[in-house]
Every structure is written in structure tokens, then in C-alpha cells.
């Protein structure tokens, strides 16, 4: 009761940090669990278009804000033209997917590959053909596509003409683009993600300037961008729900990413309050309007009174419940560099299980898809990625514990990533693929790393057998 009174937040996530065994939902006694995942558990792997496709101006593709950002902001990176060249080597990607034996492949559509200036007119035929071929090949292989509409590669023309996500004009433009995708690909796609990790789009794109478009220091812009991303997502969800779901019978969500944090002193109410505030300021910022009560978290509304836009009552009603499952991203992009505002002087932690418990308590035990999870290795590491295996085992063990011990409704897991590729502000200095790609080679062969063999085994056994 005291905890609830002191923190002043509406959710129940604070219970996670209580070390009272009668109160905390996480039973720490189970350090490793030899068990299987539920029958029909959804095993997958993912990529982002800008990270792996390459061919940034080939076949009529328009430039994205990231193509521009790479040329203007990132030193020692010529372009994503190298990368893994998935646009050219589609068959090699499909072979890699076959090797692992996944149930689904999560990939994103490059908006400027379909519509070079972002506006929905006649689609770029070569771009359309590429995604159509990919989808057909996946269907043929019984691999479920999970398609992300926006993984950060905004058409540069929209940035230059409208100021990108700062301008609410983009909401309708995004909805037009989504409509086109539903029309053209919806017969083969049952799972849609509108936006990948909007927190990073807003915070690093407009706050720190570490992501495209590279604007910094304008907190008002950060929260305006967040606001427009939420409204764009909501509009697309309603559009799909009304016009496409009845006959396409699919599901749609938004991937929300977060770190995890532990209190300096677990018995200290204010440290627990700071941890709650930390999670709320990152994950709650987007999850509360969409998975919660339709509005921003109370603490944010109070503290950010001069910069946080306001949802009208009608808008709150419109935002609320606009996701068919909770798509959750937990990986290095939310940890490094961590927003110091979010750190609140507490201790960052890689405890995925506790993060899942927090989501369960805050958002009424939703069905959860882990839409991105994994770690990274140094770029010099080739196929013997032991750290990646260690991290994967750790994360998967935590997911299994969350399912079996905490009754959290995780229905799928996306290992990140299928291929080594362009890693945003880290460019090519780190690798996240389960397949090694030599970026300097002509053929860009996909060589399975130890982690690919490990993940293949996990999928085959549906978990950890003794």
C-alpha cells in the first residue's frame, strides 16, 4: 500500500523490485530451467531493411533519412551500399532461413524503395517486385512473414518537405503507405508491425542526434515526434481493423523497446520509485497510450508540462487498445548509450524476465511477441561468436522462466539478427547476425555462426532438454 501511495503511478510494475517473496512475482530460486517452450511456440528471426538490403539507390529507390545521415554525420562509413546486399542476394537469405528452421521471418519494408519520395502514387515496380518475391518465397517455405512498415528509413523527401515526424502531416502520409502495403501484401501477411522502437526514433533522432535525422537538444521536438508516431500507429491500426482485418484476418502491433533497471537499494522506496519512473519514461511513454489508458504516464505529464503534447479525451479513446499483442524489443540499442535521464542513478540490468513481468503487471498480462532480442559482438569476431551464444542462452532461459514460472503469455521470439549488417550509429563496428557476412566480398556469402547452430538446435528441441 505504501509503495502505491508514494510512487503515484497507476500501474503495478513496482512490485517487481520488491524483495519480499510474498510480493514480488519473480521467483529467483530458479536460476536455469531445463524445459520446453509451449507447443506451437513461434520461433523467428529478424532484419531491418536499411541494415541488410544495401542497394540504396538502385532500381529507382529514393534516399532515406539514414542514407543522408550516413553521408553527413557518420565518419568512415561510405554508405549502406555494402552491407549484406539482401536486395541482390534474396536467395541466400532464404537459404539461411531454411538452415535455421524458423517459423517466421520478421523484416521491414523500405518505404523509399516502394515510394521514392514517400508519397503514395505509383509504386516503384522493382521495389514492389522485390517484396512480393520475398513474400511468395516465404509462403512457399511455410515461413510466416512478420512485416514492419517503418524501421527508421523515412524517405528523405518527407524530412526535407515537412520536417519528418515533427509534422503531423506525416500521419496521413504514413497511413496511405500502410494502406498500400495492406492492399498489395495483406493476402500473404498475417502479422504487421507499424513502427519499430519509436522511442529510439524520437530520442536519438531528435534528442541526442545520434540517429537520423540527427537533430539534437530539442525536447519539445522529441515529444512531438513521439506524439506523431503514436497517432500514426493508432490511425494505421484503426485503418487495418476497419478495412482489412475482416477479410485478411491478421494482427497488428507496434514494437516497443526498453532497457531494464534495478534499484541501488532494493528496500528503498524512492529508489524503487526511480526505477518505475525510468521504465515509465522509456517504455511507458509509448505503451501507456497504446496498451494502457490511452494517455501518457502521469509522472511524464507532470514533469514535462511544457513539452509533452496533450491527448484530447477523444484521442485517448482512439489510442487505447490499438495493438493486438505486445511486441517487445530488448537489445543493445536500448542500453547503449542509455538515456541518462532514464537511468535515474540506478543500475541498468539485462534481466529480460523481470522486464516481461513488469509488462505483465503494468498492461494487464498481454500476449507478448519478443520482436527483437539478442546482443552483439565486435566486428572482428567471425563465426565463433561464443558471447552471442551465452547471451542468447541467458535471454531464452529468462523467457522460458517467464512463461513457465511467471505465467507470462509470450507466444513468440525473434532472434536478432539474421545477418550481419549496418548497425545504426555503430555502423560496421559491431555484428549482430547469426550469419557472418564479409562486407568486402563480392558474393556476400552467409556463413552460419556458432549462434546459428545453437539457435537451430533450440528451435528443433523447442527449448532446453537435459
Amino acid at each position: 500500500i505504501l509503495l502505491r501511495a508514494v510512487t503515484g503511478f497507476s500501474g503495478d510494475g513496482r512490485a517487481i523490485w520488491s524483495k519480499n517473496p510474498n510480493f514480488t512475482p519473480v521467483n529467483e530460486s530458479q536460476l536455469f530451467l531445463y524445459d520446453t517452450f509451449p507447443k506451437n511456440f513461434f520461433w523467428g528471426i529478424g532484419t531491418g531493411a536499411l541494415q541488410v538490403e544495401g542497394s540504396w539507390k538502385k532500381d529507382g529507390k529514393g534516399p532515406s533519412i539514414w542514407d543522408h545521415f550516413i553521408h553527413t554525420h557518420l565518419k568512415n562509413v561510405s554508405s549502406t551500399n555494402g552491407s549484406s546486399d539482401s536486395y541482390i542476394f534474396l536467395e541466400k537469405d532464404l537459404s539461411a532461413l531454411d538452415f535455421i528452421g524458423v517459423s517466421f521471418y520478421q523484416f521491414s519494408i523500405s518505404w523509399p524503395r516502394l515510394f521514392p519520395d514517400g508519397i503514395v502514387t505509383v509504386a516503384n515496380a522493382k521495389g514492389l517486385q522485390y517484396y512480393s518475391t520475398l513474400l511468395d518465397a516465404l509462403v512457399l517455405r511455410n515461413i510466416e512473414p512478420i512485416v514492419t512498415l517503418y524501421h527508421w528509413d523515412l524517405p528523405l523527401a518527407l524530412q526535407e518537405k515537412y520536417g519528418g515526424w515533427k509534422n503531423d502531416t506525416i500521419i496521413d502520409i504514413f497511413n496511405d503507405y500502410a494502406t498500400y502495403c495492406f492492399q498489395m501484401f495483406g493476402d500473404r501477411v498475417k502479422y504487421w508491425i507499424t513502427i519499430h522502437n519509436p522511442y529510439l526514433v524520437a530520442w536519438h533522432g531528435y534528442g541526442t542526434g545520434m540517429h537520423a535525422p540527427g537533430e539534437k537538444g530539442n525536447l519539445a521536438a522529441v515529444y512531438t515526434v513521439g506524439h506523431n508516431l503514436i497517432k500514426a500507429h493508432s490511425k494505421v491500426w484503426h485503418n487495418y481493423n476497419t478495412h482489412f482485418r475482416p477479410h485478411q484476418k491478421g494482427w497488428l502491433s507496434i514494437t516497443l523497446g526498453s532497457h531494464w533497471i534495478e534499484p541501488n537499494r532494493s528496500e528503498n522506496t524512492m529508489d524503487i520509485f526511480k526505477c518505475q519512473q525510468s521504465m515509465v519514461s522509456v517504455l511507458g511513454w509509448f505503451a501507456n497510450p497504446i496498451h494502457g489508458d490511452g494517455d501518457y504516464p502521469e509522472g511524464m505529464r507532470k514533469k514535462l508540462f511544457s513539452v509533452l503534447p496533450i491527448f484530447s479525451e477523444a484521442e485517448k479513446h482512439e489510442m487505447r487498445g490499438t495493438a493486438d499483442f505486445f511486441a517487445f524489443s530488448f537489445g543493445p540499442n536500448n542500453f547503449k548509450p542509455l538515456n541518462t535521464m532514464a537511468k535515474m542513478g540506478q543500475n541498468v540490468s539485462l534481466n529480460l524476465r523481470e522486464a516481461l513481468n513488469w509488462i505483465k503487471l503494468e498492461y494487464n498480462n498481454p500476449r507478448i511477441l519478443i520482436a527483437e532480442n539478442g546482443w552483439f559482438t565486435d566486428s572482428r569476431v567471425k563465426t565463433e561468436d561464443t558471447t552471442a551464444i551465452y547471451m542468447m542462452k541467458n535471454f531464452l532461459s529468462q523467457v522460458l522462466q517467464a512463461i513457465r514460472l511467471d505465467e507470462i503469455r509470450v507466444f513468440g521470439y525473434t532472434a536478432w539478427s539474421l545477418l550481419d549488417g549496418f548497425e545504426w550509429q555503430d555502423a560496421y563496428t559491431i555484428r549482430r547476425g547469426l550469419f557472418y557476412v564479409d562486407f568486402n566480398s563480392k558474393q556476400k556469402e552467409r556463413k552460419p555462426k556458432s549462434s546459428a547452430h545453437y539457435y537451430k538446435q533450440i528451435i528443433r528441441e523447442n527449448g532446453f532438454s537435459l
Epitope: 503515484g8 524512492m270 514533469k303 508540462f305
Partner: antibody, heavy 119, light 107 residues
């Protein structure tokens, strides 16, 4: 270290205007709101409003609406507060304060500027 | 507007004494309350934010507590340099409002 240095004391006649400046240093000026708070002689602290130095957006307490204008010059990291139609009850020490988003509090204050309104 | 009341309006205590000031809000403000110290001719100083979080560099003899409408501010062992006026401030709602202040001096 963070510093907010305000302009010197002013004596004004009723009906006139006063413009107080607040020069910031030791942090990124455009990243945090500047708020203005005053303290009339023998009275408590009274919040006047906020100004976002990046956008120039402002928000004023109802009591001062129409009489106060908060501006900034980002090239010299300086915020300004202008109060018009001065009356004797506006005699006060005027403080600028840096607003910390994380705390929801004013974590650094200027030294104050005494404004006297007298005929 | 949310009204903030403080009591006492002034107090005298000896060095080493425990001093407690109370602050009452006219409506529930949850934990959205800060405390400041103001010395004559000096810039005000943030001591505590969000009811009980000590600002960096503030001595641990200062502490805060409470929630909802009733809050306390305590100096566990009064020191000569603590002679000042102390203000509570709410940010639950605009306009931001301060208490009338409590003047603390040494007996």
C-alpha cells in the same frame, strides 16, 4: 558549473516596463526550460511562467497573462523576462531558474534582480 | 490553483536540534513536491525533489516524506548554516505554486 547570472537592480515608475536578463552558462542552454519566479517583499515565492529556449515557446501563469513576455537570445545563451504596466505591487526580487525535467524541479537559480516600482 | 500551506511560519531551535516543517496541499498532489532553501541575498537552492529525493551535494541531515496532501521536511541536526527560509513547491498542476515559507533561525 551551472550558473545563471541576472542583470542588476531596476527602479521603474508605475505604468512602465522592465526587462530582466538571465545569462546561462555551464550547460546546453537550449536543452532546459527557463522559468521565472518572483518574491515580493515579505511575501512567498510566486511562479510567473516558463520559456523553452530551443523553440521559444512560452507558458504564463494566468495572473501575468498579457503583461509578461519571456524571450531568449540563443546566440548569447540569455533569457529575458519583460513585465509591462508595472504597479507598486510588482516590487519584488525576480529570479530566473533552470527547470530539470527529470526532477520536475528548479535545480539552479539566478541570484535575483530587485525591481522597485515607485512614483 | 493548488494552495500550499506551511507550518510553522517561523521557528527557533538550538544547534543540533531536530527540526520538522510540515506542508499541506489543498488537494492530492501525489509525490509531486519539492523543497527549497532561500537565504537572504543568495540564489534559492533545491534541496529535495519528489518528496524525499535528496539533490546531489545536499547534506544527508535534510530529509523529506509524505504523500497525497501532507508532507514533512526534517533537519535531523540543525547547523548554523541552515538558517534560512524553506519553501515547499508542487508541480502536480499548473500554475506551479509554493508554500508561504518557514523561517528557521538559531535560538
Amino acid at each position: 558549473q551551472v550558473q545563471l547570472v541576472q542583470s542588476g537592480a531596476e527602479v521603474k515608475k508605475p505604468g512602465a516596463s522592465v526587462k530582466v536578463s538571465c545569462k546561462a552558462s555551464g550547460y546546453t542552454f537550449t536543452s532546459y526550460d527557463i522559468n521565472w519566479v518572483r518574491q515580493a517583499t515579505g511575501q512567498g515565492l510566486e511562479w510567473m511562467g516558463w520559456m523553452n529556449p530551443h523553440s521559444g515557446n512560452t507558458g504564463y501563469a494566468q495572473k501575468f497573462q498579457g503583461r509578461v513576455t519571456m524571450t531568449r537570445d540563443t546566440s548569447i545563451n540569455t533569457a529575458y523576462m519583460e513585465l509591462s504596466s508595472l504597479r507598486s505591487e510588482d516590487t519584488a526580487v525576480y529570479y530566473c531558474a533552470k527547470y530539470n525535467w527529470n526532477y520536475g524541479a528548479f535545480d539552479f537559480w539566478g541570484q535575483g534582480t530587485m525591481v522597485t516600482v515607485s512614483s | 490553483d493548488i494552495q500550499m500551506a506551511q507550518s510553522p511560519s517561523s521557528l527557533s531551535a538550538s544547534v543540533g536540534d531536530r527540526v520538522t516543517i510540515t506542508c499541506q496541499a489543498s488537494q492530492d498532489i501525489s509525490i509531486y513536491l519539492n523543497w527549497y532553501q532561500l537565504k537572504p541575498g543568495k540564489a534559492p537552492k533545491l534541496l529535495i525533489y519528489d518528496v524525499s529525493n535528496l539533490e546531489t551535494g545536499v547534506p544527508s541531515r535534510f530529509s523529506g516524506g509524505g504523500s497525497g496532501t501532507d508532507f514533512t521536511f526534517t533537519i535531523s541536526s540543525l547547523q548554523p548554516e541552515d538558517i534560512a527560509t524553506y519553501y515547499c513547491q508542487q508541480y502536480d498542476n499548473l500554475p506551479l505554486t509554493f508554500g508561504p515559507g518557514t523561517k528557521v533561525d538559531i535560538k
